[in-house]
């Protein structure tokens, strides 16, 4: 099945400093966004290989992408407090599937002490559930649209 | 979650044309991956076309250079441009997110014959 493996589980950073937040996917994906978690989910970026990525405007002029869409690092830079949260990727295939979260602290530079990440991977509760029938499409009509050709992303 | 409401289906002789529209609501429009779907009398929903945030767009084989689908992110909307219509492409059009799989919207039907 497919999967997306999502790396770190969690870093803690200073305010102003950059990370790094990879994903992963063994191919076959049609694009593959970055959500920050929360009571309202918001999109960061989307990133589709070929094509120019689409990014919220909060993080316009801070992000870049090395990689590509199946094994993607995304950098967020110069961030700010109000960018602590969960990150979790979720990749456009024929099911849709997550990563396993990104825990971000964006700390004052004075107590990066007191805030620090356990080993231990973002609690499951953290992450959306996969809504129900979240095949893409409909698992009956799976085979429907055959994979893109590599060509037709390019603008 | 955007809201997603079709129109612009009707009666239409085979050859002939139709623009289907799909009007969202909320504020997340230009990330939503958007797909139109169909459901023929008796058969299972099919998707037809998609297109992603990127505007990529991919379509299912019988529809192939007949079918066009667009979008316009200013003004929250997705299209569905159908020429060259068959007898077989009668069916209720729906539209939805694919990231998200909220519920279906009541679709618009579109009905190709002599």
């Known amino acids: 099945a497919q999967e997306v493996q999502q790396s770190p589980h969690c870093t803690t950073v200073p305010v102003g400093a950059s990370v790094n937040i990879t994903c992963s996917t063994s191919g076959g994906l049609r694009g593959i966004y970055l959500r920050q978690l929360g009571p309202q989910p918001q999109d960061i970026i989307y990133y589709e290989d070929g094509v120019v990525p689409t990014t919220d405007r909060r993080f316009r002029g801070r992000i870049d992408f090395s990689g590509s869409q199946d094994n993607l690092t995304i950098t967020m830079h110069r961030l700010q407090l109000s960018d602590t949260g969960t990150y979790t990727c979720q990749a456009i295939t024929e099911v849709n599937v997550y990563g396993s979260g990104t825990l971000v602290l964006v700390t004052e530079e004075q107590s990066q002490g007191w805030h620090r990440c356990s080993d231990a991977p973002p609690r499951a509760s953290a992450l959306p559930a996969p809504p129900t029938g979240s095949a893409l499409p409909d698992p009956q009509t799976a085979s429907a649209l055959p994979d893109p050709p590599a060509a037709s992303a390019l603008p | 979650q955007v809201q997603l409401v079709e129109s612009g289906g009707g009666l239409v002789k085979p050859g002939g044309s139709l623009r289907l529209s799909c009007a969202a609501s909320?504020?997340?429009?230009?990330?939503?991956?958007m797909g139109w779907y169909r459901q023929a009398p008796g058969k299972q929903r099919e998707l037809v076309a998609d297109?992603?945030?990127?505007?990529?767009?991919n379509y299912a084989d019988p529809v192939k250079g007949r079918f066009t689908i667009s979008r316009d992110n200013a003004k929250n909307s997705l299209y569905l441009q159908m020429n060259s219509l068959r007898a077989e492409d009668t069916a209720v059009y729906f539209c939805?997110?694919?990231?998200?799989?909220?519920?279906w919207g009541q679709g618009t039907l579109v009905t190709v014959s002599s």
């Open positions: 909320g504020s997340s429009f230009h990330f939503a991956f």
């Open positions: 939805r997110d694919l990231r998200s799989w909220g519920a």
């Open positions: 297109i992603s945030p990127g505007n990529s767009t």
